[in-house]
């Protein structure tokens, strides 16, 4: 007789999940020496234990601690990109400018990246058919707990002036119901952390508009202002070109504004 | 290119002891777990011993456990299997093997050697 399933309203366990986070530790130390000392078995097992046999609506960040600990990594606190909306730029940037860092260079950002993994409660097995939709189901789900998790550790580490990359095309850019808005910006610490800069990137080739006096991004800085940290604005008119410049600072066409 | 070069193997009595060992080359050792696997005559292939990349953790087939003690030093791109109170029925080729990891009873294997033989008789 089947057993009775949950079905929940979001996708399921990426296929290939344990093999897929143990792929990725292993990629990480061989590509960072200094993670060499990280057991990829402690870490898988400690990231499993976080969820499975747990009721998938009920996770809480306690749970993901032994896989905090083990995944303990010092990155450069005053080289910390963050990001809203707008991954594969930040992303390309962090590839370019390589001593900077968004959450998804460090090990434990990297393992789970792109990833979804649930598991039900008192069986030991993953849920490959469906997950919690933090919207529709729950916002306790492994996935929302992980990030939430990790994105408060990584603001807390930050310090001097912390960059955010926000994405100008969207109706709010700044959204306080992100990742960055409701989770990042509340833990940065203000004896640490001297000025938020956000860098608002432009969708569209012809717009000149000034994206740092939008209402969102006012709002950005009032309640950074609140927490004793500066704020400061930038405009990236060309994401193309900003990423080239990156690459190649001595061009010519790089002194313009971008 | 990755090699794994496997030596060690011979013929021993039962109860007696052999120690394998296995030689990496062309990758990262120290990021990836590291197998013993076997295939005695006209059988499939068992898994016997595993141990992570550290060396932290360390797993054994119930039919050697007690018995078999694996090991590796990352200084050296090596992986050993001391193997004692060796049976007939240890009988088999061994293989050195590279992977990821383990979930559960599953070994993500990657690389393996050519292998060596062991023969236990009298």
């Known amino acids: 007789v089947p057993r009775w399933r949950q079905q929940w309203s979001g996708p399921g366990t990426t296929k290939r999940f344990p093999e897929t986070v143990l792929a990725r530790c292993v990629k990480y130390t061989e590509i960072h020496p200094e993670m060499r000392h990280v057991d990829c078995q402690s870490v898988w097992d400690a990231f499993k234990g976080a969820f499975i046999s747990k009721h998938p609506c009920n996770i809480t960040e306690e749970d993901y601690q032994p896989l905090m600990k083990l995944g303990t990594q010092t990155v450069p606190c005053n080289k910390i990109l963050l990001w809203s909306r707008i991954k594969d730029l930040a992303h390309q940037f962090t590839q370019v400018q390589r001593d900077m860092f968004t959450l998804e260079d460090t090990l434990l950002g990297y393992l789970a990246d792109d990833l979804t993994w649930c598991g039900e409660f008192n069986t030991s097995k993953i849920n490959y058919q469906s997950c919690p939709d933090w919207r529709k189901d729950c916002s306790n789900n492994p996935v929302s707990v992980f990030w939430k998790t990790v994105s408060r550790r990584f603001a807390e580490a930050a310090c001097d002036v912390v960059h955010v990359m926000l994405n100008g095309s969207r109706s709010k850019i700044f959204d306080k119901n992100s990742t960055f808005g409701s989770v990042e910006v509340h833990n940065l610490q203000p004896e640490k952390v001297q000025t938020l800069e956000a860098w608002v990137i432009h969708g569209g080739r012809e717009d000149s508009r000034d994206l740092c006096q939008d209402p969102t991004i006012k709002e950005l800085e009032s309640i950074i202002s609140k927490r004793n940290i500066q704020f400061s604005c930038k405009n990236i008119y060309r994401p193309d070109k900003f990423l080239q410049c990156v690459k190649n600072p001595e061009d010519s066409s790089c002194t313009s504004e971008i | 290119e990755v090699q794994l070069l496997e030596s060690g193997g011979g013929l021993v009595q039962p109860g007696g002891s052999l120690r394998l060992s296995c030689a990496a080359s062309?990758?990262?050792?120290?990021?990836?777990?590291m197998s013993w696997v076997r295939q005695a005559p006209g059988k499939g292939l068992e898994w016997v011993s595993g141990?992570?990349?550290?060396?932290?953790?360390?797993y054994y087939a119930d039919s050697v456990k007690g018995r078999f003690i694996i090991s590796r030093d990352n200084s050296k791109n090596t992986l050993d299997l001391q193997m004692n109170s060796l049976r007939a029925d240890d009988t088999a080729v061994y293989y050195c093997?590279?992977?990821?990891?383990?979930?559960?009873?599953?070994?993500?294997?990657?690389?393996r050697g050519q292998g060596t033989l062991v023969t236990v008789s009298s």
């Open positions: 141990i992570s990349n550290t060396g932290i953790n360390t």
């Open positions: 062309g990758f990262t050792f120290s990021s990836y777990a």
């Open positions: 093997a590279s992977g990821k990891g383990w979930d559960g009873n599953t070994w993500y294997e990657d690389y």
